[in-house]
Interface confidence: medium
């Protein structure tokens, strides 16, 4: 229904706390370089204005769209051009072009220092002094680094952050309590960030239809007892919500997400038997819980999928007269029977089925032609199953760090032109798939591995798009979203690459490495490993093992030495010489 004042409507629906949080996220995602203090000032102004509109919907400017109001606020920032360059050109445009322009200037890799967690005591002091400001900083810092983070979910993580601090800051050993709990929140949030970026990429590149297909498959897996009409309704709603968030309509997105949670909880009987526990929670937790809900039990009496989609003589009539509904029904029926498949795989199967009908329904004997389609799915199913098997075996053998290194070598050989920091980030994230997925029960491994890898590879594509350097990466990234992972898996050593010349300074280290946290130490070593592969793309596994083993011993030895600086200065050149020889 239409409201006189959109901003008043959202303020009333969301409540002041969530309203302010979402406005802060919106501003932080649009203007990623502005300090917290500047954004919080704008947030307060917008909130005060919203309150005047709640009091009187006919007040001046209350009838303006939220994009107009937000855009006007952003464009009024002094020195906008000095800080943001061509983003300031957006301000010369009218809505909706102005908002589109802002969206195009979102930076997936902003030049910001990594978010450093303060030490426990300092954290607790500032949290206890002003919890609202502390959590505001958290929202700001995450949102500006992840300009597509799903806003209502970020509010949920802020709430989790709040819970952890409230609990741990009363403990005697604050650090022991905080570290593992905040690490867990951070890990979940980082995964959420890459997953949401993938959804926005899907929406931006391939439109709502592609996203809705993804949603139908996902919902059908989770709610196999729900009927197609119910699944379609849920998928349509989820598509709308994600479109809004990806498009910067964060207030509408959060409001609609809360509405969807309400609907699901009021209609549990026709959706899933697993929802009740979620439905007893407050709004943010409820939505999050529903988004992470376990699969309902598959109905026992499902007939073979072949009856409707292969054996029925009317298949071509069904396909011709209502393509989207028929293919949607196929995707629904196949997905509800296969919670053990990844969504990417299910979409590839649906695509294969569609291509088969396109071909066969134009032939003389369609049933004979499409009669073997289910058997033709087999290689498509086997490929990701083998990927999971070989990668999980490798992970179990090497552990997370060793597995990351194996992935790093593989991907540096596939795309040596890509910058080393990007390769290291991608390989570290891809390598985490082992810890995340390989320990799961067999039936959950494939969906976990492939859908996670797809999200990480999307991040690689997004970064590469900014500065394209590898034709192979461009080729994999510009194809269909569901074919990306198989495309990357199929890449081999890039034969066109001219090896990088050996630079001693790339492999020169100093005593500062000794005081780095383990994670930073690993990144230093992995950076060296990528550089080695760029120097010798065809180095054997044994050669790389020798050099990296030698390197690890060198660091270990010098960090234990009495005169560390001297050790690094004298032993370093020897290491470089030995490495060159080993790789010759």
């Amino acid at each position: 229904e239409a409201h006189k004042s959109e901003i008043a409507h959202r303020f009333k629906d969301l409540g002041e706390q969530h309203f302010k949080g979402l406005v802060l996220i919106a501003f932080s995602q649009y203007l990623q370089k502005c300090p917290y203090e500047e954004h919080i000032k704008l947030v307060q102004e917008v909130t005060d204005f919203a309150k005047t509109c709640v009091a009187d919907e006919n007040a001046e400017n209350c009838d303006k769209s939220i994009h107009t109001l937000f855009g006007d606020k952003l464009c009024a920032i002094p020195k906008l051009r000095d800080n943001y360059g061509e983003l300031a050109d957006c301000c010369a445009k009218q809505e909706p072009e102005r908002n589109e322009c802002f969206l195009q200037h979102k930076d997936d890799n902003p030049n910001l220092p990594p978010f450093q967690r303060p030490e426990a005591e300092a954290m607790c002091t500032s949290f206890q002094e002003n919890p609202t400001s502390f959590l505001g900083h958290y929202l700001h810092e995450v949102a500006r680094r992840h300009p597509y983070f799903y806003a209502p979910e970020l509010l949920y993580y802020a709430e989790k952050y709040n819970e952890v601090l409230t609990q741990c800051c009363t403990e005697s050993d604050k650090a022991a309590c905080l570290t593992p709990k905040l690490d867990a929140v951070k890990e979940k949030a980082l995964v959420a960030a890459v997953r949401q970026r993938m959804k926005c990429s899907s929406m931006q590149r391939f439109g709502e239809r592609a996203f809705k297909a993804w949603a139908v498959a996902r919902m059908s897996q989770r709610f196999p007892n729900a009927e197609f009409a119910e699944i379609t309704k849920l998928a349509t709603d989820v598509t709308k919500i994600n479109k809004e968030c990806c498009h910067g309509d964060l207030l509408e997105c959060a409001d609609d997400r809360a509405e969807l949670a309400k609907y699901m909880c009021e209609n549990q009987a026709t959706i899933s038997s697993k929802l009740q526990a979620c439905c007893d929670k407050p709004v943010l937790q409820k939505s999050q819980c529903l988004a992470e809900i376990e699969h309902d039990n598959i109905p026992a009496d499902l007939p073979s999928i072949a009856a409707d989609f292969v054996e029925d003589k009317e298949v071509c009539k069904n396909y011709a007269e209502a393509k989207d509904v028929f293919l949607g029904t196929f995707l629904y029926e196949y997905s509800r029977r296969h919670p053990d498949y990844s969504v990417s795989l299910l979409l590839r199967l649906a695509k294969k089925y569609e291509a088969t009908l396109e071909k066969c329904c134009a032939e003389g004997d369609p049933p004979a032609c499409y009669g073997t389609v289910l058997a033709e799915f087999q290689p498509l199913v086997e490929e990701p199953k083998n990927l999971v098997k070989t990668n999980c075996e490798l992970y179990e053998k090497l552990g997370e760090y060793g597995f990351q290194n194996a992935v790093l070598v593989r991907y540096t050989q596939k795309a040596p032109q890509v910058s080393t920091p990007t390769l290291v980030e991608a390989a570290r994230n891809l390598g985490r798939v082992g810890t995340k997925c390989c320990t799961l029960p067999e039936a959950q491994r494939l969906p976990c591995v492939e859908d996670y890898l797809s999200a990480i590879l999307n991040r690689l594509c997004v970064l590469h798009e900014k500065t394209p350097v590898s034709e192979k990466v461009t080729k994999c990234c510009s194809g269909s979203l569901v074919e990306r992972r198989p495309c990357f898996s199929a890449l081999t050593v890039d034969e066109t690459y001219v090896p990088k010349e050996f630079k001693a300074e790339t492999f020169t280290f100093h005593s500062d490495i000794c005081t780095l946290p383990d994670k930073e130490k690993q990144i230093k070593k992995q950076t060296a490993l990528a550089e080695l592969v760029k120097h010798k793309p065809k180095a054997t596994e044994d050669q790389l093992k020798t050099v990296m083993g030698d390197f690890a011993q060198f660091v270990d030895k010098c960090c234990k030495a009495a005169d560390k600086d001297n050790c690094f200065a004298t032993e370093g050149p020897n290491l470089v010489a030995r490495s060159k020889e080993a790789l010759a």
Partner: nanobody
Framework: EVQLLESGGGLVQPGGSLRLSCAAS????????VAWFRQAPGKEREFVAG????????YYADSVKGRFTISRDNSKNTLYLQMNSLRPEDTAVYYC???????????????????WGQGTLVTVSS
């Protein structure tokens, strides 16, 4: 749950017409695939006509094409079968069946329909 109740059967002369109705409750009839089946004494139950849910795609058995018309009135939540040019071999008990879930797909396979009416007898005889 879907409840189905057929009516309109009876005795009719060859060449005559009848209109069968099937009133549905517990479900909107336009949301589900629905069909008419028939079973003659001592024979298997056979598909007569069907209509998809959400999309008005109609299907007919070859033996009734051009003579029978399936339709529905969503406001009355009722399915119809208009039978013209009736023949003695059309004599059977006519059943209405519903198949929620996959709305589009009206299968000719009786086993795929979970909901059935109790049937109405049609006798074509002079």
């Amino acid at each position: 749950e879907v409840q189905l109740l057929e009516s309109g059967g009876g005795l009719v002369q060859p060449g005559g017409s009848l209109r069968l109705s099937c009133a549905a409750s517990g479900r909107y009839i336009d949301e589900t695939a629905v069909a008419w089946f028939r079973q003659a004494p001592g024979k298997e139950r056979e598909f007569v006509a069907g209509i998809g849910g959400g999309v008005d795609i109609t299907y007919y058995a070859d033996s009734v094409k051009g003579r029978f018309t399936i339709s529905r009135d969503n406001s009355k939540n009722t399915l119809y079968l208009q039978m013209n040019s009736l023949r003695p071999e059309d004599t059977a008990v006519y059943y209405c069946a519903a198949r929620p879930g996959s709305p589009l797909i009206t299968s000719k396979v009786a086993d795929l329909y979970p909901y059935w009416g109790q049937g109405t007898l049609v006798t074509v005889s002079s």
